[in-house]
């Protein structure tokens, strides 16, 4: 927790941010909360980015004030205006770009004082993997596909029955650049699969970790997948 200290007689107010990651091409949230103030017209929210001359976003007197906004953020930012009164200064960032990564400062002024907190924002691409039985292959084979990742992730296979086994010798992973020349499609194939077992395809980079599970029995196939961002920590 980082507490913003007041300057020149004003009290300090607590401002809290959460490090987060943005999925390029999609919308992201830069999270920031502060001690609420009942005087909405006195609240000022400023978002700044290290190395950027203009403001990322400014909200004051109940509305956006974008005259000082940096060109790279033009038309891409918004606060949750109806939530400001209860202490939510989070910023919605539209169409996240790779270049949006960096250190942001959420700076708050209220009638009670001032405070700020920094936020590390990572950008990349991450997506949910899907594991399927590859019926085209000559032997029992699983195929794990995830459409968008960046930076290039690692792919590791695991199995419930053979816990701790190393599947690198019986798997093959490829990365195919997508049309926008940044993100890549991940395809990993696992050979010599046995029936009545649960296999997991784990894809991970420094931003996210995703797992696709498949359970193959004689009568049915069950799939499950989940994705987790790695660097969400409060400041």
């Amino acid at each position: 927790l980082i507490i913003g200290f007041g300057i020149s007689g004003r009290h300090s107010i607590t401002v809290t941010t959460v490090a987060s990651a943005g999925n390029i091409g999609e919308d992201g949230i830069l999270s920031c909360t502060f001690e609420p103030d009942i005087k909405l017209s006195d609240i000022v929210i400023q978002w700044l980015k290290e190395g950027v001359l203009g403001l990322v976003h400014e909200f004051k007197e109940g509305k956006d004030e974008l005259s000082e906004q940096d060109e790279m953020f033009r038309g891409r930012t918004a606060v949750f205006a109806d939530q400001v009164i209860v202490g939510n200064a989070s910023l919605r960032l539209k169409n996240v770009q790779l270049t949006d990564a960096g250190t942001y400062k959420c700076y708050i002024i209220t009638s009670k004082g001032k405070g700020n907190a920094n936020l590390e924002y990572k950008t990349g691409a991450f997506s949910m993997p899907e594991v399927n039985v590859d019926y085209n292959a000559s032997s029992e084979t699983l195929r794990c596909e995830a459409p968008r990742w960046f930076p290039q992730p690692t792919v590791v296979w695991a199995s419930q029955v053979d816990q701790g086994a190393n599947f690198s010798e019986v798997s093959n992973t490829s990365f195919e650049l997508n049309s926008e020349n940044v993100t890549m499609k991940v395809v990993s194939v696992l050979y010599n699969v046995t029936i009545n077992n649960t296999y997991s395809c784990m894809i991970e980079n420094d931003i996210a970790k995703a797992t696709g599970d498949i359970k193959v029995t004689e009568s049915e196939i069950k799939r499950r997948s989940h994705l987790q961002l790695l660097n969400s920590k409060a400041s």
Epitope: E35, P36, I38, D42, A81, D82, I85, V86
Partner: antibody, heavy 117, light 107 residues
Framework: EVQLQQSGTVLARPGASVKMSCKVS????????MHWVKQRPGQGLEWIGA????????EYNPNFKGKAKLTAVTSATTAYMELSSLTNEDSAVYYC??????????WGQGTTLTVSS | EIQMTQSPSSMSASLGDRITITCQAT??????LNWYQQKPGKPPSFLIY???QLAEGVPSRFSGSGSGSDYSLTISNLESEDFADYYC?????????FGGGTKLEIK
């Protein structure tokens, strides 16, 4: 579930003081403003003031400065309002109301104060 | 202090009608306006926030609109449970102030 439970009906003499309570459950009491609103019989709503329990900060409607005193006991998640030098004009229903997700989003059931000699 | 002028102060309507209540502020309140419904002997209940957003559980026949200093609450296809008192609240500038209220009665 958010609940604001207010103390019961009060009968008081002119010139006396009364203290009413508002017990909060279901949200982080210390981190959000708690407000008090007055409603005279058959009349509209009038904002009295608010308290931020985490720091005991208070804000008052100028019309109620010296009339109302707001306090809170964080360990009991309870807000209090004391009204002093009571007159007939103070006879009303008094509501506590939170600003948790939005301004005045949850309300207590009200405390009826009757001032009579 | 911002004054909120609510009109009409009372009105009667029939089931199925569409009605509109207005609130005018003495200055621009930048959409910082909520609406509340109150039934006899009960506390007000949260209806609409930030001019046009419906509070949880509020039927879609209720809607709010406005900007600057002029705001309105519309109820379309009135139902029996809608007959009550309605109040607007501005929270843009200190102190927060309510409109005088509108009593909606059945015709």
């Amino acid at each position: 579930e958010v609940q604001l439970q207010q103390s019961g009906t009060v009968l008081a003499r002119p010139g006396a003081s009364v203290k009413m309570s508002c017990k909060v459950s279901g949200y982080p009491f210390t981190s959000y403003w708690m407000h008090w609103v007055k409603q005279r019989p058959g009349q509209g709503l009038e904002w009295i003031g608010a308290i931020y329990p985490g720091k005991s900060d208070t804000e008052y409607n100028p019309n109620f400065k010296g009339k109302a005193k707001l306090t809170a006991v964080t360990s009991a998640t309870t807000a209090y309002m004391e009204l002093s030098s009571l007159t007939n004009e103070d006879s009303a229903v008094y509501y506590c109301t939170s600003t948790w997700t939005h301004y005045f989003d949850y309300w207590g059931q009200g405390t009826t104060l009757t001032v009579s000699s | 202090e911002i004054q909120m002028t609510q009109s009409p102060s009372s009105m009667s309507a029939s089931l199925g009608d569409r009605i509109t209540i207005t609130c005018q502020a003495t200055q621009d309140i930048v959409k910082s306006l909520n609406w509340y419904q109150q039934k006899p002997g009960k506390p007000p209940s949260f209806l609409i926030y930030y001019t046009a957003q419906l509070a949880e559980g509020v039927p879609s026949r209720f809607s709010g609109s406005g900007s600057g200093s002029d705001y309105s609450l519309t109820i379309s296809n009135l139902e029996s449970e809608d007959f009550a008192d309605y109040y607007c609240l501005q929270f843009y500038e200190f102190p927060p102030t309510f409109g005088g209220g509108t009593k909606l009665e059945i015709k």
